[in-house]
């Protein structure tokens, strides 16, 4: 006979899991805000910057009340995967102007990756249905110019900041319902 069965594995408190996800999200939010500020200082650019390939903002602050946990986590994971892909693209194709931000962009990518893994873990701990594998996304075209790379970076960081801000609010609200 095999070894005697160990004590039953206690599933971690989902609220504690949610807490650590909030902390990671909030940390990434502050990093993104600072990196965007750094970028604007290096390359002053007026107006809003958009990139059609970025996800649309998941939710207005006013609609937070209607959120349900599975929907929030699934949508957040999908949006963050898209931003991760865009940050990877930026590091690869952003051009020499963005090389000065390389350490920070690398750190941002690593933290985004860590947050995505944390979300995946949280979804399995909460026994939420796992989303189907992501369909292969069409490749992103390289920026048309150095200035295009900067504008793309501003759009990516701006969109990621809004998404993370929404995520912190949503996760904190959902925590009260667990």
């Amino acid at each position: 006979p095999g070894p005697p069965p160990g004590p039953p594995r206690v599933s971690p408190d989902p609220r504690a899991e949610l807490d650590s996800t909030v902390l990671l999200t909030r940390s990434l939010l502050a990093d993104t805000r600072q990196l965007a500020a750094q970028l604007r200082d290096k390359f002053p650019a007026d107006g809003d910057h958009n990139l059609d390939s970025l996800p649309t903002l998941a939710m207005s602050a006013g609609a937070l009340g209607a959120l349900q946990l599975p929907g929030v986590l699934t949508r957040l994971r999908a949006d963050l995967l898209s931003y991760l892909r865009h940050v990877q693209w930026l590091r690869r194709a952003g051009g020499s102007s963005l090389k000065t931000l390389e350490p920070e962009l690398g750190t941002l990518q690593a933290r985004l990756d860590r947050l995505l893994r944390r979300l995946q873990l949280l979804m399995s701990r909460l026994a939420l249905p796992q989303p189907p594998p992501d369909p292969p996304a069409p490749p992103l075209a390289p920026p048309s110019s150095a200035w295009g790379g900067i504008r793309a970076a501003l759009a990516i960081l701006g969109g990621l900041h809004l998404t993370l801000d929404w995520a912190v609010r949503g996760l904190l609200l959902l925590k009260t319902r667990l």
């Epitope: 902390l23 909030r26 502050a30 750094q38 200082d41």
Partner: antibody, heavy 120, light 108 residues
Framework: EVQLVESGGGLVQPGGSLRLSCAAS????????MHWVRQAPGKGLEWVAY????????YYADTVKGRFTISRDNAKNSLYLQMNSLRAEDTAVYYC?????????????WGQGTLVTVSS | EIVLTQSPATLSLSPGERATLSCSVS???????LSWYQQKPGQAPRLLIY???NLASGIPARFSGSGSGTDFTLTISSLEPEDFAVYYC?????????FGQGTKLEIK
């Protein structure tokens, strides 16, 4: 040695304006984000505004938004706070403060403060 | 806005005693964004601790910080006469940056 010296405080009537200055020395001013923090008489500390090294990102406390403007002149190693539409509740000692080496390390260096009194 | 609540409001102790000051945060914050300051009457505040537990330059080792999530602590292991002052905690993760209301450490 890092030094921050505020000036420009004084007595002003409600609705009036005042411009505070902060002269910086002992460090590369153009490399650091700068803050204004205030303290009403006998009260605690209240953060007022922040400006990045290149002036392209600025944040304000809700209590001063639309009335105060933070700016800097890196060539002159100077930080400014233009205060308009002053109210009695703006009465405080105003400090300029420099971030440490990274934005998440707190307000490492402070000036001695300049007193602003708003009263009729 | 993230609200920081310090306790106790006033702490009366004698030199040589251990002081424990608390800072409770309304929302979860990563520990890297919490700082502590000391302020003496008529003086500007002075940074003591940043990132929850790192001593700022020139701060004696009797000061230490700890905590995570929503509960943070400043400890002074053995009070010296010059430590009697007001202490503030502050968060830097979210705009507006906010301070606690302060804890006054007075001589018993």
């Amino acid at each position: 040695e890092v030094q921050l010296v505020e000036s420009g405080g004084g007595l002003v009537q409600p609705g009036g304006s005042l411009r505070l200055s902060c002269a910086a020395s002992g460090f590369t001013f153009s490399s650091f984000g700068m803050h204004w923090v205030r303290q009403a008489p006998g009260k605690g500390l209240e953060w007022v505004a922040y400006i990045t090294p290149g002036s392209n990102t600025i944040y304000y406390a809700d209590t001063v938004k639309g009335r105060f403007t933070i700016s800097r002149d890196n060539a002159k190693n100077s930080l400014y706070l233009q205060m308009n539409s002053l109210r009695a509740e703006d009465t405080a000692v105003y400090y300029c403060a420099r971030e440490y080496y990274s934005y998440d390390e707190g307000f490492a260096y402070w000036g001695q403060g300049t007193l602003v009194t708003v009263s009729s | 806005e993230i609200v920081l609540t310090q306790s106790p409001a006033t702490l009366s102790l004698s030199p040589g005693e251990r002081a424990t000051l608390s800072c409770s945060v309304s929302d979860l914050i990563p520990s890297q964004y919490l700082s502590w300051y000391q302020q003496k009457p008529g003086q500007a505040p002075r940074l003591l601790i940043y990132r929850t537990s790192n001593l700022a330059s020139g701060i004696p080792a009797r000061f230490s910080g700890s905590g995570s999530g929503t509960d943070f602590t400043l400890t002074i292991s053995s009070l010296e006469p010059e430590d009697f002052a007001v202490y503030y905690c502050q968060q830097g993760v979210d705009v507006p940056f906010t301070f606690g209301q302060g804890t006054k450490l007075e001589i018993k």
